[in-house]
């Protein structure tokens, strides 16, 4: 039975041009973390694997970058890059867990951290 | 040890479909990305596309105008290469290969010659 | 797409002696967030497919002879052969794989005089 919980950065803004951090936390479980993935509407944009370590699609690379921990940054940000984002836990033996972060690209300076929340 | 072996030769006519398999062994089949890469006679090295078993997601050269298809077994670790409409130029060998982030491609498979003749 | 351009094309070698293979790239491969290069080495011998060499630009693949050897950073990079042997005679290649598509320089054949 699965018992664990993702706990993420939730809805979040951040300004065209700058940077924002993806984060999400696997907890309530004693599974092993075998693999994240992360994506954006159905593109992969990192593999964090335990064995393997980061491979960071070449098509992200001038863009995005690993870290900290099992998180994503991504930077040079444009309006384009506004839009779901999902960190998928492969654990054994769990099996999978998602997380889904929204982020949301502004042109000024108003940008502020919306609030966590938890995905069953 | 890893392995990764290819179906053999095959002999196509222009317009005509072909499909390589790959069949991967001595390793995690899901970790790691499969490449196809392929070399025309005399020729170099050209990336076709690569696909992750891990999550199904795949990267095509454009080049190829759509006409080739990725798709992988995890059951039997099996990785096939399809490629349609064929023409005279796509005759060459094509190679299969492992690939993971930083480590580049380091086994390969031992090749499939594919000669399209009418 | 990044253009990988080899130089020489053709290189003879007497055993026993260094080579050297020239790699530019059209564009920088160094990922700023690891500090590394996405260059790779690999040689074709003949009837053969290719094999790894060197990765990272400079990090020799396991079970390569340690005669080989990976320099450069951002857009120009060496494969250094220390002492040729007969058994390295073949096509060498340079390829990043830093950003799609994943291309490969023209090859560069090292034969024996």
């Known amino acids: 039975m699965m018992t664990g919980t993702i706990e993420t950065t939730g809805n979040i803004s951040a300004e065209k041009g700058g940077s924002i951090i993806l984060q999400c936390h696997l907890s309530s479980t004693t599974a092993q973390v075998t693999q994240v993935n992360w994506e954006q509407q159905d593109q992969l944009l990192a593999i964090c694997n335990a064995d393997l370590g980061w491979h960071i699609s070449p098509s992200f690379k001038d863009r995005v970058a690993p870290g900290p921990g099992l998180g994503l940054t991504l930077q040079s940000l444009t309006v384009n890059d506004t839009g779901e984002y999902f960190c998928i836990y492969h654990t054994y033996p769990d099996g999978t867990y998602t997380g889904r972060i929204f982020l949301e690209v502004l042109e000024s300076s108003v940008a502020e951290h919306g609030a966590r929340f938890q995905i069953p | 040890q890893v392995q990764l072996v290819q179906s053999g030769a095959e002999v196509k006519k222009p317009g005509a479909s072909v499909k390589v398999s790959c069949k991967a062994s001595g390793y995690t089949f899901t970790n790691y990305w499969i490449l196809w890469i392929r070399q025309a006679p005399g020729q170099g090295l050209e990336w076709m596309g690569d696909i992750y078993p891990g999550g199904h997601y795949t990267n095509y050269n454009e080049k190829l105008q759509g006409r080739v298809t990725l798709t992988a077994d995890t059951s039997s670790s099996t990785a096939y290469m399809e490629l349609r409409s064929l023409r005279s130029d796509d005759t060459a060998v094509y190679y299969c290969?492992?690939?993971?982030?930083?480590?580049?491609?380091?086994?390969w498979g031992q090749g499939t010659l594919v000669t399209v003749s009418s | 797409d990044i253009v990988m351009t080899q130089s020489p094309l053709s290189l003879p070698v007497t055993p026993g002696e260094p080579a050297s293979i020239s790699c530019r790239s059209s564009q920088s491969l160094l990922y700023n967030s690891n500090q590394k290069n996405y260059l790779a080495w690999y040689l074709q011998k003949p009837g053969q497919s290719p094999q790894l060499l060197i990765y990272w630009a400079s990090t020799g693949e396991s079970g390569v002879p340690d005669r080989f050897s990976g320099s450069g950073s951002g857009t120009d990079f060496t494969l250094k052969i220390s002492r040729v042997e007969a058994e390295d005679v073949g096509v060498y290649y340079c390829?990043?794989?830093?950003?799609?598509?994943?291309?490969f320089g023209q090859g560069t054949k090292v034969e024996i005089k």
């Open positions: 390829q990043q794989y830093y950003s799609y598509p994943f291309t």
């Open positions: 290969t492992r690939y993971y982030g930083p480590y580049a491609m380091d086994y």
